[in-house]
């Protein structure tokens, strides 16, 4: 029951996380204009991974895609790649984990297969979460660098006339969404990996030969590496041999202090 709950919760947490990663990737507010001094232009700039937007004080908003691919910073391309890899891995992980859920029956799928699928999806969620966190962190680092550079060269002039007013940009909402979503996906992945341990059937019965000695009569049968004295089910010295070998499950043997292995 605890395993099912852990797996189910891991799935839900990862689902929320991946939804958050997708939302963050699509959001336009990765960086927003720092309103340290509102100049004469009553306009507010903000940027996403895919387009740059501007909002007028009247409420009018206009966004434009980054039409050039080569003119963009390599770091931005890296962030895009990390976020997309995170989404793709997360989506595959979700697909795998649906079939791995203990509460869902698909044909005669064994627990070992479900355990493997749970582990696979868990690892995928962990990597997905790490990709998102890395992507957002790289962008945040770019922002911090740009912020301090802008502060240093706030005004650059030619002949005493102010030519450029460096606009400073600060963390947008998408960064926080991305960090939280990446963290949730990571936690969900860890939970799936923990659930996998509980799902995996513990192989304690190694199919081999078992000898049951009881009084004078000895029964030979294939089974686990178990040697038992006659303190089991045959205490009345009855003949066990019935002309055929039995499996471990057919003869009920109770553990005793004389059992080996």
């Amino acid at each position: 029951m605890a395993v099912t709950a852990c797996q189910g919760l891991g799935f839900v947490v990862s689902l929320i996380g991946i939804a958050g990663i997708i939302a963050a990737t699509c959001m336009d507010q990765w960086s927003t204009q720092d309103l340290y001094n509102n100049p004469v232009t009553a306009v507010f700039n903000y940027q996403g991974l895919w387009r740059s937007c501007v909002r007028e004080s009247s409420g009018f908003t206009e966004c434009r895609g980054y039409f050039t691919l080569l003119g963009l910073p390599a770091m931005l391309q890296a962030v895009r790649a990390l976020m997309i890899v995170g989404i793709v891995l997360g989506a595959i992980g979700l697909l795998v984990s649906i079939f791995a859920l203990k509460c869902i029956r698909i044909g005669s799928m064994e627990d070992s297969a479900k355990a493997n699928m749970t582990l696979t999806s868990g690892i995928m969620f962990i990597v997905s979460g790490l990709c998102a966190i890395a992507g957002v962190s790289v962008f945040a680092n770019m922002l911090v660098t740009n912020f301090w550079m802008s502060t240093a060269n706030m005004y650059t002039g030619m002949g005493g006339m102010v030519q450029t007013v460096q606009t400073r940009y600060t963390f947008g909402a998408a960064l926080f969404v991305g960090w939280v979503a990446g963290g949730l996906t990571l936690i969900g992945g860890v939970m799936m990996c923990i659930a996998c341990r509980g799902l995996a059937p513990e192989e304690t019965n190694y199919k081999a030969v078992s000898y049951h000695a009881s009084g004078h009569s000895v029964a030979y049968k294939p089974g686990g590496f178990k040697a038992s004295t006659g303190f089991g089910s045959n205490t009345k010295n009855k003949k066990i041999y019935d002309g055929g070998a039995r499996t471990e499950d057919e003869v009920q043997s109770y553990p005793s202090k004389h059992d080996y292995v």
């Epitope: 232009t41 937007c53 206009e62 910073p73």
Partner: nanobody
């Protein structure tokens, strides 16, 4: 570095008209372009703004007489001023919120300004 250059200023009689031109060089992309003016001994004030989509905004006092337009192919913005008055005298500055090469963050770039003198 993005550079803006204004031209088209000069002296004109009251009631006359002028067309100011602003050209942006080395700008990868501009979120908007605008015109501002500074009358002698006064603060710089906003005149008009144009977005890449063609949407325009004007200062209330100038809406009727001023008209902003753009030519995206030439990276240029124009300000047509008609029925000019002596109080329109001042230096007209072009401003653009543009991205330089290799950046995603626009900065406010300003031109050197062009002088407009309206005599009565």
């Amino acid at each position: 570095q993005v550079q803006l250059a204004e031209s088209g200023g000069g002296s004109v009689q009251a009631g006359g008209s002028l067309k100011l031109i602003c050209t942006a060089s080395r700008a990868t992309d501009c979120n908007y372009m605008s015109w501002h003016r500074q009358a002698p001994g006064k603060e710089r004030e906003f005149v008009s703004r144009i977005f890449p989509s063609g949407k325009t905004t004007y200062a209330d006092s100038m809406k009727a007489r001023f008209s902003i337009s753009q030519d995206n192919a030439k990276n240029s913005v124009y300000l047509l001023m008609v029925n000019l008055k002596p109080e329109d005298t001042g230096k007209y500055y072009c401003q653009g919120s543009c991205r330089g090469p290799g950046s995603i963050w626009p900065s406010d770039y300003w031109g050197q300004g062009t002088q407009v003198t309206v005599s009565s």
